[in-house]
């Protein structure tokens, strides 16, 4: 089931999955000057079983230098720049995405890809936080989001993750404000079933998680 | 919680246009294409065409070039559809559409009457 | 264009029954099929994406199949909130299209 929402937003941070689960959508989306193609599927979809599962679709980019856009369709500079390559090689890397069952490892990128990929996430999945150049992290707890299904409804338990400026003289943890979760309720107040799925045998490797698996930014 | 809120019915004459808008919230509004699908009773849905907020780059059904033109004002996190000549064959409810079809707006009556 | 024809306009059904809507391309789609459900007086509600993955929130007596060309929504046990027109749609090329709908009555 797909999540009805993003994961949250956590100034100065971006966030990864590691793997990604059976039914995650993939937005075929092109860099500035290119679009789809006209028989193009609008997403990549991971799909297959427990044993084997992959992207389905290819999402192609075609100049669109022949179509009228509001804009110029000049690339932008930052869209200029060289992907970082997907693979996450480190000695530090916790698990293998091929090893999870069930589950899609990043795709590759394709010619003329956007300069951020745009995820439908879905029921159980798990993201990780880490800050962005330039910021250290204060942490309360797991830098990680989770979308569950509770009351019927999917949200994304929220990341205890503070990234803050080098520089800046900051609190230290200990005087942080407690974030508050969405809806406004503490994570533990679950009065009603709260689903989950495998993704329980990733948690233990959120706290020793090193930057490696962010070796792709897309933004 | 991710809304697309229409603009109100529209009563208007033949030969003029109209404007309606798609206001989102809930998520970020330059990630997604919105789309737009006109319903006509006996006639079920047809897909008008899209609009990428975030470069507002468009896309339109053959049918419906030169009828419909979309905007983008992000600022407001609000799409516009303009419906340009009117004619009764125009009357219909038109919906937006984002997330990759899996969030609609509560749809824009329009009747084109003299 | 991609056709898409659901050859029922209405069917008939009665409460805990088990009923399929069929759906037919005109060329191979692949799996990028998408049903909706629509009430009276409603927008359309997305129910299934590529053929057959459920949405969140919606029941899983309503189950998507098929690919390339024939497609089927499925309602097992069929409930009176079930009542409404159904409709495929295909995004595997421009321009996105619909089926004509079919209408679920309930005896």
């Known amino acids: 089931e797909l999540c009805d929402d993003d994961p949250p937003e956590i100034p100065h941070a971006t966030f990864k999955a590691m793997a990604y689960k059976e039914g995650t959508m993939l937005n075929c989306e092109c860099k500035r000057g290119f679009r789809r193609i006209k028989s193009g599927s609008l997403y990549m979809l991971c799909t297959g079983n427990s044993s084997h599962s992959s992207w389905d679709n290819q999402c192609q980019c075609t100049s669109s230098a022949t179509r009228n856009t509001t804009k110029q369709v000049t690339p932008q500079p930052e869209e200029q720049k060289e992907r970082k390559t997907t693979e996450m090689q480190s000695p530090m890397q916790p698990v293998d995405q091929a090893s999870l069952p069930g589950h899609c490892r990043e795709p590759p990128p394709w010619e003329n890809e956007a300069t951020e990929r745009i995820y439908h996430f879905v029921v159980g999945q798990m993201v990780y936080y880490q800050c962005v150049q330039g910021y250290r992290a204060l942490h309360r707890g797991p830098a990680e989001s989770v979308c569950k299904m509770t009351h019927g409804k999917t949200r994304w338990t929220q990341p205890q993750l503070i990234c803050t400026g080098e520089m800046e003289t900051s609190q230290f943890p200990g005087e942080e404000k407690p974030q508050a979760s969405p809806e406004g309720r503490p994570e533990s107040e679950t009065s009603c079933l709260v689903t989950t799925t495998d993704f329980q045998i990733q948690t233990e490797m959120a706290a020793t998680m090193e930057t490696s698996i962010f070796t792709t930014e897309y933004q | 919680q991710i809304q697309l809120q229409q603009s109100g019915a529209e009563l208007v004459r033949p030969g003029t246009s109209v404007k309606m808008s798609c206001k989102a919230a809930?998520?970020?509004?330059?990630?997604?294409?919105i789309g737009w699908v006109k319903q006509r009773p006996g006639h079920g849905l047809e897909w008008i065409g899209d609009?990428?907020?975030?470069?507002?780059?468009?896309n339109y059904n053959e049918n419906f070039k030169g009828k419909a033109t979309f905007t983008a004002d992000t600022s407001s996190s609000t799409t516009y559809m303009q419906l340009s000549s009117l004619t009764s064959e125009d009357s219909a409810i038109y919906f937006c559409?984002?997330?990759?079809?899996?969030?609609w707006g509560q749809g824009t009556p329009v009747t084109v009457s003299s | 264009d991609i056709v898409l024809t659901q050859s029922q306009k209405f069917m008939s059904t009665s409460v805990g029954d088990r009923v399929s809507v069929t759906c037919k391309a005109s060329?191979?789609?692949?799996?990028?099929v998408a049903w909706y459900q629509q009430k009276p007086g409603q927008s359309p509600k997305a129910l299934i994406y590529?053929?057959?993955y459920r949405y969140s929130g919606v029941p899983d007596r309503f189950t998507g199949s098929g690919s390339g060309t024939d497609f089927t929504l499925t309602i097992s046990n069929v409930q009176s909130e079930d009542l409404a027109e159904y409709f495929c749609?295909?995004?595997?090329?421009?321009?996105?299209?619909f089926g004509g709908g079919t209408k679920l009555e309930i005896k």
């Open positions: 590529s053929a057959s």
């Open positions: 749609q295909q995004y595997n090329s421009y321009p996105y299209t």
């Open positions: 559409t984002s997330r990759n079809f899996a969030k």
């Open positions: 809930g998520y970020t509004f330059t990630n997604y294409w």
């Open positions: 609009i990428h907020p975030g470069g507002s780059y468009t």
């Open positions: 060329q191979n789609v692949g799996t990028n």
